[in-house]
Amino acid sequence: TQNKALPENIKYGIVLDAGSSHTSLYIYKWPAEKENDTGVVHQVEECRVKGPGISKYVQKVNEIGIYLTDCMERAREVIPRSQHQETPVYLGATAGMRLLRMESEELADRVLDVVERSLSNYPFDFQGARIITGQEEGAYGWITINYLLGKFSQKTRWFSIVPYETNNQETFGALDLGGASTQITFVPQNQTTESPDNALQFRLYGKDYNVYTHSFLCYGKDQALWQKLAKDIQVASNEILRDPCFHPGYKKVVNVSDLYKTPCTKRFEMTLPFQQFEIQGIGNYQQCHQSVLELFNTSYCPYSQCAFNGIFLPPLQGDFGAFSAFYFVMNFLNLTSEKVSQEKVTEMMKKFCSQPWEEIKTSYAGVKEKYLSEYCFSGTYILSLLLQGYHFTADSWEHIHFIGKIQGSDAGWTLGYMLNLTNMIPAEQPLSTPLSHSTYV
């Protein structure tokens, strides 16, 4: 008789990434009998919640329920009803909420309280809402990309799943850029670390990994821009800020109260003789780059080598996956190709930043002006962070792979987080069975 496939026992999981600028809901699925295999979990849906990050709801917490409705209803549609009760839901908040907690633990808890109340109204199995640490964000991002790239798999393949996958088991480093923080995580060549705060030890699938990680709070692209503006307005002679990081002809009024709202600008805060100032773009990459470099304190390092601000950074090792805003920005600028050298990227950025604002608006008519206006800064910031902050060079630039998705799953911390919380990454290598017993009869 012919082999007949049995209906597969599929499991689902939901993770909400409550970032500083927005919230995204991810739905994952996997075959139940292969829970401990590597690479079997994949993303089936991403739903971007309309509106800003949850930390912005601190004065209107009653709106959080409505804010989450569309994406939670989407999850209800995507996941079969019979699976709803069994489906775990996790919410992890990142640097936007870390910043809010720095200002007021009570306010941060109030937001999370309302999040739990809202999510408990759905038929899923809500597991918890919390602010994840920067270390976790880095570590889970590293786990995600290496899981998806098959780096934890003991089976060597003669083929590659993705273009930049090499058949060796060397893990990729992870570079994550958000709105309010950025993370760098990799396995350094030297096992011993000068800074225990930046050291993580994992045992995954029977192998030990000694991982370096650091999260730079306030160095996500949005907070870095606020920092730069707060720094530059200090020396402005009047309420006009001629800014090289914005296109020529671009104008925008900024409230000083908004500028000093975030803890990230506290170090630059001063009493100004005006309540508002106007940014006037002059579109000069080189000057923008110089201004950005002033955000990185490289004069002090209590270790053999530092990134910036006195934070230990071992010598870079191996290939890196750069995802989240690293990818979104570079993809918009059409600079994600493996063939584009660092020199070429710099050249393209010079050209892009110098383009008049009116011309840019016409060329990218479908893009929201708020986002469009910031790509010159963001691209420049990415280059500065990678080259001067993390010490990539023109040569090692080719080891950076700008990644959006790997085999249909977004690169980011959420998958690694769910794999960990559902105990789907075993410490030991599972015993392989020749045939999964429940697949065929």
């Epitope: 597991q127 918890g128 919380l421």
Partner: nanobody
């Protein structure tokens, strides 16, 4: 790792009330679902009730529904179990339990990694 300390146990007459408390040290309290389990002599440890990190989700064993109430005070890192209309069959050692990023429903199934308190004796006399 969180540490749990129960208090409030004792001897009470049938029909009476008792309030147990469990204080948690270390860890971020709101990240833990909290629960109460009980173990009568010669019996297995049984689920009584559990509550989510911010208190919006609760589960109760059928045997205590309507008589027992679980609550939590996140500012005080404490979970409470108010026991009313106590019966002799409620006599047991009551254990406080904490489970990180685990739903009350999973606690009920004793799934996930659970941290236990030392237990407090509750005796209901007839």
């Amino acid at each position: 790792q969180v540490q749990l300390q129960e208090s409030g146990g004792g001897l009470v007459q049938a029909g009476g009330s008792l309030r147990l408390a469990c204080t948690v040290s270390r860890g971020t309290f709101s990240e833990y679902s909290m629960g109460w389990f009980r173990q009568a002599p010669g019996q297995e440890r049984d689920f009584v009730t559990a509550i989510s990190g911010f208190g919006h989700i609760t589960h109760y064993a059928d045997s205590v529904k309507g008589r027992f109430t679980i609550s939590r005070d996140n500012a005080a890192n404490t979970v409470y179990l108010q026991m009313n209309t106590l019966k002799p069959e409620d006599t047991a050692v009551y254990y406080c339990a904490a489970a990180w990023q685990t739903s009350p429903r999973r606690m009920m199934q004793m799934a996930g990694s659970i941290t236990w308190g030392q237990g407090t004796q509750v005796t209901v006399s007839s």
